[in-house]
Interface confidence: low
């Protein structure tokens, strides 16, 4: 029997216009078989990923995918820049596309920009 | 093939720590978690806790938390696990396991026994 | 933490008969569509051998006398037909959810 390879599907350059001050949701989405991986997200720091050890996380579980969510609560200026999240299973380090997260300051906003909520599939694969 | 070299059996007083070495050889070290296993004589199995040897990150059981000491060096392919502040139950069977695509527990060492006595 | 429970605790089964192993989940260890229980058999003197992944698919070499089946939280393992060599303990695993939890094992004896 073959072995179930982990894959997260992240849009290739995904961005995501936020408010600082509200909550947000930053979704990994990751399908898996046999056993759940360990997956962690990271913010981009340069050329390096730094790992979020102390962020809320936590899983969505849906019939054909899961998602593997960061918390913001809330979203803070210091937030706007690129994540990526990591997927340790096994055989496999698997990364993914990063995903940008542009935060308007509340105070400068004077109207709230539309976020892309990654609802287009099917997802650009990366393995 | 994927193959483990567990150290061997040690026998400490209690109150004091082991240093157990699981040596792995077969495949790249650095891609495969390595769970550590406890058993005790003549009965189940306990998830100590496992630890990925590319970036050192772990999980434990909180049962062990503070306790378990996972480690991993790279250079010579081996994990190591340290448990300190021994007690009788801690006399047991430690094994290594490494997973592969389908489950956590595919290869085993032959296990290292710990005995705590005074 | 999630608990297994084995049964029984012992088992003696006539040679080409078929055992029947019992493993309950304290709670649902399904998810994704998977159920997340291994089986593992236990010589003495020996580590435990991987038999059955996920509930119902066999390991690498294992032979297709060992078969597992269930969901949710009630799973078991079949043996059929018994030969010598399979007198050993037989231990469930869930990897649902950290920490990862093992059943108490049953001890198989060929009669």
């Known amino acids: 029997k073959e072995s179930c390879d982990v894959q997260l599907y992240i849009k290739r350059q995904s961005e995501h216009s936020i408010l600082a001050g509200d909550p947000f949701e930053l979704e990994c989405p990751v399908k898996y078989c046999a056993n759940r991986p360990h997956v962690t997200w990271c913010k981009l720091n340069g050329t390096t990923c730094v790992k979020l050890e102390d962020r809320q996380t936590s899983w969505k579980e849906e019939k054909n995918i899961s998602f593997f969510i960061l918390h913001f609560e809330p979203v803070l200026p210091n937030d706007n820049g690129s994540y990526r999240c990591s997927a340790n299973f096994q055989s496999n380090l698997i990364e993914s596309h990063s995903t940008t997260l542009y935060v308007t300051d509340v105070k400068s906003a004077s109207e709230r920009p539309s976020k892309d909520e990654m609802a287009s599939r099917p997802w650009l694969l990366y393995r | 093939q994927v193959q483990f070299q567990q150290s061997g059996a040690e026998l400490a007083r209690p109150g004091a720590s082991v240093k157990l070495s699981c040596k792995a050889s077969?495949?790249?070290?650095?891609?495969?978690?390595i769970q550590w296993v406890k058993q005790r004589p003549g009965q189940g199995l306990e998830w100590i806790g496992t630890?990925?040897?590319?970036?050192?990150?772990?999980r434990e059981n909180q049962k062990f938390k503070g306790r378990a000491t996972l480690t991993a060096d790279k250079s010579s392919s081996t994990a190591y696990m340290q448990l300190s502040s021994l007690e009788s139950d801690d006399s047991a069977v430690y094994y290594c396991a490494r997973g592969n695509g389908n489950s956590w527990f595919a290869y085993w060492g032959q296990g290292t026994l710990v005995t705590v006595s005074a | 933490d999630i608990v297994l429970t084995q049964s029984p605790a012992s088992l003696a089964v006539s040679l080409g008969q078929r055992a029947t192993f019992s493993c309950r989940a304290s709670e649902s260890v399904d998810d994704y569509g998977i159920s997340f229980i291994n089986w593992f058999q236990q010589k003495p003197g020996q580590p435990p051998k991987l038999l059955i992944y996920?509930?119902?698919n066999q390991g690498s070499g294992v032979p297709a006398r060992f078969s597992g089946s269930g969901s949710g939280t009630d799973f078991s393992l079949n043996i059929h037909p018994l030969e010598e060599d399979d007198t050993a303990m037989y231990f469930c695993?869930?990897?649902?959810?950290?920490?990862?939890?093992f059943g108490g094992g049953t001890k198989l004896e060929i009669k």
């Open positions: 077969g495949y790249t070290f650095t891609d495969f978690w």
């Open positions: 996920a509930a119902s």
């Open positions: 630890i990925y040897p590319g970036d050192g990150d772990t």
């Open positions: 695993l869930q990897s649902r959810e950290i920490p990862y939890t």
